[in-house]
């Protein structure tokens, strides 16, 4: 059996204020350093303890950073992306994509573009419960006749 991982993808705008030691995180990725196969995007590899990002709490390791101060991070060399952050100023606005893993199920694979990453048990359990309640009510009704 192959494992299946479903992801819930959300986007968020995160505004950070540069602290005494900077923004406080590391990145990987870029056109010359693909971190995710077939994706040259920029990903957060490390959040530094007590840094601006850690104290803010919203940016997470594994997040994909889509833009910095409105500037797209697509098709950038790794060092160019690093330089963009270093020159971003005191107040830095990040457009971030979070990928939340919601289930490790049995087989199949859901493409990234498919937004319906809801675990099947979340649908089946309520349906099963409703069926049981309906069956019980029907039996009680028959007994009263």
């Amino acid at each position: 059996m192959n494992g299946r991982v479903d992801y819930l993808v959300t986007e968020e705008e995160i505004n950070l204020t540069r602290g005494p030691s900077g923004l406080g995180f590391n990145i990987v990725g870029g056109t010359d350093q693909q971190y995710v196969s077939n994706d040259s995007g920029i990903y957060v590899s490390r959040i530094k303890e007590n840094g601006a990002a850690a104290l803010d709490g919203r940016l997470q390791e594994g997040d994909k950073i889509l833009s910095v101060n409105g500037q797209d991070l697509k098709n950038l060399l790794h060092q160019d992306a690093v330089d963009l952050f270093r020159n971003a100023g005191y107040a830095v606005s990040l457009r971030v994509q979070h990928r939340l893993q919601v289930q490790n199920g049995p087989i199949g694979h859901r493409g990234e573009g498919d937004p319906s990453g809801i675990p099947i048990f979340m649908v089946l359990v309520p349906v099963f419960a409703l069926t049981m309640v309906a069956a019980w009510a029907f039996m009680r009704y028959r007994q009263q006749l």
Epitope: G22, L23, G24, N26, S45, K48, Q79
Partner: nanobody
């Protein structure tokens, strides 16, 4: 479990050469910055050389032209070749690893590193 193990070093004559190696286990080097740092008796730990996650090398001014950093990702090893050694190069040399590139500073900044080895003594005398 991330681990760095250093080898090499020892006693060298002024003008001599030595190579120190840093082998990583528990992770692959490809996406890591690796730095070499040293601490002389009574002094603060200082950056010597580093190689970032895309292979760009950096050196502190005092070792430029004498020290060479290199990495062999297949062997999960980073090397520091030290030539034309001077008595002031005497110190405990440490290697350190950091996942990715800091958006705040170059890899010569020791505050950005998460993983450190136990250090190896280099004495130039």
């Amino acid at each position: 479990h991330v681990q760095l193990v250093e080898s090499g070093g020892g006693l060298v004559q002024p003008g001599g050469s030595v190579r120190v190696s840093c082998v990583s286990s528990g992770f692959i080097l490809d996406y890591y910055a690796i730095g070499w740092f040293r601490q002389a008796p009574g002094k603060e730990r200082e950056g010597v050389s580093c190689i970032d996650s895309v292979g760009r090398a950096y050196y502190v001014d005092s070792v430029k032209g004498r020290f060479t950093i290199s990495r062999d990702n297949a062997k999960n090893t980073v090397y520091l070749q030290m030539n034309s050694l001077k008595p002031e190069d005497t110190a405990v040399y440490y290697c350190a690893a950091d996942f990715g590139s800091s958006v705040d500073s170059t890899c010569l900044n020791n505050q950005q590193y998460d993983y450190w080895d136990q250090g190896t003594q280099v004495t130039v005398s």
